[in-house]
């Protein structure tokens, strides 16, 4: 018995199909004689150029998903379109992006919220991954909260995952922060600082964002300069003190550790002081003290009389006891340290006779 094709059914090898795989559709319809022509439909729309019993798609794409149906035709007539078959195409999440929810710019210490967005996914996204890994909070699926963001948190990337994970391009957090690792560096001299030296100090820092910075130098809390270098053409002992530098940008300012600048100098401002005074009665005691200002302190003293004769005393104090009238005259001292020598002006000691001596005369 010959008859026109009966309503057709579609068999799919295989559904669900993974994106990129191949799929074959078979149109089955009882007919005698066998169908000679087929019309294929995808979601109700005729597929152009497909007239065979089998349709082969070598590389399936997400848009190939949907209902496939067919109509068979022989010399006796055209069959009816059956209910068709559903092709499910599975694929990783598409167009994944990491989105920063915060207003820009982000500053060190801020709380940063990021979301992981995607365009489509089959099957549904069930989890998210983040790079780098951190002890960060995920308040909800696809949302990351970074509390107290660090200056060195540079980029973050997320992945949306179903059976596969799709990674977004990393997003730059561009965290802004105050200058870091601010330090004073002595450029010149590389050795100890002597009075009269040319001295250069540099204010260094390792990084800053934004890069535009200002420098401030201070000594004992007083502002000295606003350049990265602090220069002394000829340093003096009065320049000694506690120095620090500050670097600031629009986010904040950072200070270096304080550094005590020490100036070494030969003994200066020497003077001979006399006790109990510069007029002493014979027989009493007179103490001459060599007072000076030196760094390092004076290590060696030399005493001289009015004839520039050195005296056999090398301590800071010269004690004359009992003092004699012959001790009257001008004295001076010389102080020596590792830097050099300094001398005092002359100081005159007057020794007068005692009443007893005058009485005997």
């Amino acid at each position: 018995v010959q008859y026109a094709p009966e309503p057709s059914t579609v068999q799919i090898l295989h559904s669900p199909a993974v994106e990129g795989s191949q799929v074959e559709f078979l149109c089955m319809s009882l007919a005698n004689p066998l169908p000679t022509n087929y019309t294929w439909y995808h979601n109700g729309k005729e597929m152009q150029g497909r007239t065979e019993e089998k349709v082969h798609i070598p590389k399936i794409l997400p848009w190939h998903a949907g209902t496939y149906s067919c109509v068979a035709e022989n010399i006796l007539g055209t069959g009816q379109r059956g209910p068709g078959a559903e092709l499910d195409v599975q694929y990783p999440p598409k167009k994944v992006t990491t989105v920063i929810q915060n207003p820009m710019p982000i500053r060190e210490g801020d709380t940063v919220t990021l979301s992981c967005n995607y365009n489509s996914s089959n099957p549904s996204v069930t989890r998210y991954e983040w790079k780098p890994h951190g002890a960060w909070e995920e308040p909800s699926l696809g949302v990351l909260k970074i509390q107290n963001v660090g200056w060195d948190n540079t980029t973050i990337a997320c992945a949306a995952c179903n059976s596969w994970c799709s990674w977004a391009s990393p997003v730059a957090l561009n965290v802004q922060y105050a200058p870091r690792d601010v330090r004073v560096r002595k450029i010149k001299p590389l050795s100890e600082i002597h009075s009269g030296n040319s001295v250069s100090l540099q204010c260094d820092f390792s990084s800053s964002h934004p890069k535009e910075v200002q420098f401030f130098w201070e000594k004992n809390g007083r502002l000295l300069g606003k350049e990265s270098q602090l220069n002394f053409d000829s340093i003096s002992p009065e320049d000694a003190g506690s120095y620090s530098c500050w670097v600031n940008n629009s986010i904040g300012q950072t200070a270096s550790k304080a550094w005590t600048l020490e100036v070494l100098y030969a003994p200066r401002r020497l003077r001979v002081s006399m006790s109990p005074g510069d007029q002493v009665m014979e027989g009493k005691s007179a103490t001459l003290t060599c007072e000076s200002d030196a760094n390092p302190p004076v290590s060696h003293y030399t005493w001289f009389d009015w004839n520039n004769q050195s005296l056999p005393y090398h301590s800071q104090k010269l004690r004359l006891e009992p003092v004699k009238v012959q001790h009257s005259g001008a004295y001076w001292c010389q102080g020596t340290n590792s830097v050099g020598k300094g001398r005092s002006p002359l100081s005159t000691l007057t020794v007068y006779y005692s009443p007893e001596t005058i009485g005997r005369r």
């Epitope: 330090r183 002595k186 450029i187 010149k188 590389l190």
Partner: antibody, heavy 125, light 108 residues
């Protein structure tokens, strides 16, 4: 990244002249001293001298004074070590290094970091 | 000039062991101005310690420095395979700055 890149290995004859270079990058070259250090085959490290590119002030180790010349060109971030007349005993690896440091408290520290990879100089007839 | 003498010349140890390297100065090194460097074959030296005891950036805490005056020590608490190298001390307290002759730490 702070880097010092040194010129390539040299093979010379005794009596010839030579100038090797060290190029700094990733920092303000003019504000850091550069040191030159010699290491003879199988031996230890010897500081030859240092230069401040900002004004080309140079300090030589007395052992090397008059034997070599250290110079710098801050405009191209280069430091140089040169010989006017090489000897076989100049055969060695020569390193340049940045003199880093900082001051705090009452101290000022200095150190060599980073170092170039070295230039091997071979002097042989 | 200050002469630095390192001892021993060679130290033969196994990974995991403790290494103690000595550096003695011919005169006192002011303010502990002493640094330590590590040099592996075919490589440039690398800064480990400055100021006798401060670790340089990125140096593992198994490296420690101590000492003052004329006697200084570098200690590696547990030797790792990458620690076998030559170690140099260097003073920067007085001019000219000088290096010790080095201590080689080799695998036993």
């Amino acid at each position: 990244e702070v880097q010092l890149v040194q010129s390539g290995a040299e093979v010379k004859k005794p009596g010839e002249s030579l100038k090797i270079s060290c190029k700094g990058s990733g920092y303000n070259f003019a504000t850091y001293w550069i040191a030159w250090v010699r290491q003879m085959p199988g031996k230890g490290l010897e500081l030859m001298g240092i230069i401040y590119p900002g004004d080309s002030e140079t300090t030589y180790n007395p052992s090397f004074q008059g034997q070599v010349t250290i110079s710098a060109d801050k405009s191209i971030s280069n430091a140089y070590l040169q010989w006017s007349s090489l000897k076989a005993s100049d055969t060695a690896m020569y390193y340049c290094a940045r003199v880093g440091g900082y001051c705090s408290g009452t101290s000022c520290h200095n150190w060599f970091d980073p170092w170039g990879l070295g230039t091997l100089v071979t002097v042989s007839s | 000039e200050i002469v630095l003498t390192q001892s021993p010349g060679t130290l033969s140890l196994s990974p995991g062991e403790r290494a103690t390297l000595s550096c003695r100065a011919s005169q006192s090194v002011s303010s502990s101005y002493l640094a330590w460097y590590q040099q592996k074959p075919g490589q440039a030296p690398r800064l480990l310690i400055y100021g006798a005891s401060s670790r340089a950036t990125g140096i593992p805490d198994r490296f420690s420095g101590s000492g003052s005056g004329t006697d200084f020590t570098l200690t590696i608490s547990r030797l790792e395979p990458e620690d076998f190298a030559v170690y140099y001390c260097q003073q920067y307290g007085s001019s000219p700055w000088t290096f010790g002759q080095g201590t080689k730490v080799e695998i036993k």
